[in-house]
């Protein structure tokens, strides 16, 4: 019998290479059974994950999965960093793996770097 625990399917060690000024949707795939849990996004600051308040979020439903979406309209250089979603389920908190956004500020980039180039520049997270 399939588990009815809430599961958050953000891939472990996942990355997104995105550009300042572009719109972007960060998806948190959520599996649940009867009642959709309350889901929130937070941004990692060292070992603390700071809850994102007042941001545009939405739900998208697909056949076996729901997606809790954090909207970036548009992406800002300060959006660089790692994000995690978490669900409140039966008074317990379930946390996802973190996913990292590598933001390139197009004003300071003569051309858009490749996705792998971004992966080799983790210092961007702290700039």
């Amino acid at each position: 019998k399939e588990s009815c625990d809430v599961q958050l399917y953000i891939k472990r060690q996942s990355y997104h290479s995105i550009f300042a000024g572009d719109p972007f949707k960060l998806e948190c795939p959520v599996k649940y059974c009867a009642h959709r849990p309350q889901v929130t996004w937070c941004k990692l600051n060292g070992t603390t994950c700071v809850k994102l308040e007042g941001r545009h979020t939405s739900w998208k439903q697909e056949k076996n999965l729901s997606f809790f979406i954090l909207h970036f309209e548009p992406v800002l250089p300060s959006d660089n960093g790692s994000y995690r979603c978490s669900a409140n389920f039966l008074s317990a908190i379930i946390e996802s793996h973190s996913t990292t956004l590598y933001v390139t500020d197009v004003k300071s980039a003569s051309e858009r770097p490749s996705k792998d180039e971004m992966a080799s520049r983790p210092w961007l997270l702290y700039s």
């Epitope: 599961q7 997104h16 996705k115 971004m118 992966a119």
Partner: antibody, heavy 120, light 112 residues
Framework: QVQLQESGPGLVKPSGTLSLTCADS????????IHWVRQPPGKGLEWIGR????????RYNPSLKSRVTISSDKSKNQASLKLSSVTAADTAVYYC?????????????WGQGTTVTVSS | DIVMTQSPDSLALSLGERATINCKSS???????????LNWFQQKPGQPPKRLIY???KLDSGVPDRFSGSGSGTDFTLTISSVQAEDVAVYYC?????????FGQGTKLEIK
């Protein structure tokens, strides 16, 4: 049933480019990571790199990074490997493998491997 | 890079004997999520590697329970409690915690 199948030329000339494809069935590649691993004759396994087919983001072994490109095509449910400026040292069996998702994240399914010989 | 060092390089045992293969990593494999992504693979001649053990000690489905894994941090062990003829293979440890992913050099198991 999860299956991965590598294909491509078995012989590549020195200084040429090795090109392989990994055709995947029984799962949707965008939900996983696809890795490439190689094994020179009589030697051990070497990780080449991986791709997240959901967004094309790659991670490579630094020892090969300047020569390797991994890509994917979600519509065909396949991944590809290109290795440029090959030498005899690149002669190996090349495998693609799937990294399963939550909660284990390990290489749970492998192709049979394809032998590539670099020779003129 | 994380260096994975296996010992011994080869092992010749009689049927029914206990096999112990060690794997030492140059850094801790404990990930930020609290899990340790250390895996063991078995490779028989002419075949691709087959996953035996994941997350240090979890046995893959269909793998006989004579196989077991243990360890933490940087030191890990694969044990075969009673070696059978079909266990003749090369065994590799693999770490999935850090980039680049790395394998041990392999341990060849033979029957005396």
């Amino acid at each position: 049933q999860v299956q991965l199948q590598e294909s491509g030329p078995g012989l590549v000339k020195p200084s040429g480019t090795l090109s392989l494809t990994c055709a995947d069935s029984g799962f949707n590649i965008k939900d996983t990571y696809i890795h490439w691993v190689r094994q020179p004759p009589g030697k051990g396994l070497e990780w080449i790199g991986r791709i997240d087919p959901a967004n094309g983001f790659t991670r490579y072994n630094p020892s090969l990074k300047s020569r390797v490109t991994i890509s994917s095509d979600k519509s065909k449910n396949q991944a590809s490997l290109k290795l440029s400026s090959v030498t005899a040292a690149d002669t190996a069996v090349y495998y693609c493998a799937r990294e399963d998702g939550y909660p284990y994240y390990t290489l749970d399914a492998w192709g049979q491997g394809t032998t590539v010989t670099v020779s003129s | 890079d994380i260096v994975m060092t296996q010992s011994p390089d080869s092992l010749a045992l009689s049927l029914g004997e206990r096999a112990t293969i060690n794997c030492k990593s140059s850094q801790s494999l404990l990930d930020v999520d609290g899990k340790t992504y250390l895996n063991w693979f078995q490779q028989k001649p002419g075949q691709p590697p087959k996953r035996l053990i994941y997350l240090v000690s979890k046995l893959d489905s269909g793998v006989p329970d004579r196989f077991s894994g243990s360890g933490s941090g940087t030191d890990f062990t694969l044990t075969i409690s009673s070696v059978q003829a079909e266990d003749v293979a090369v065994y590799y440890c693999w770490q999935g915690t850090h980039f680049p992913r790395t394998f041990g050099q392999g341990t060849k198991l033979e029957i005396k």
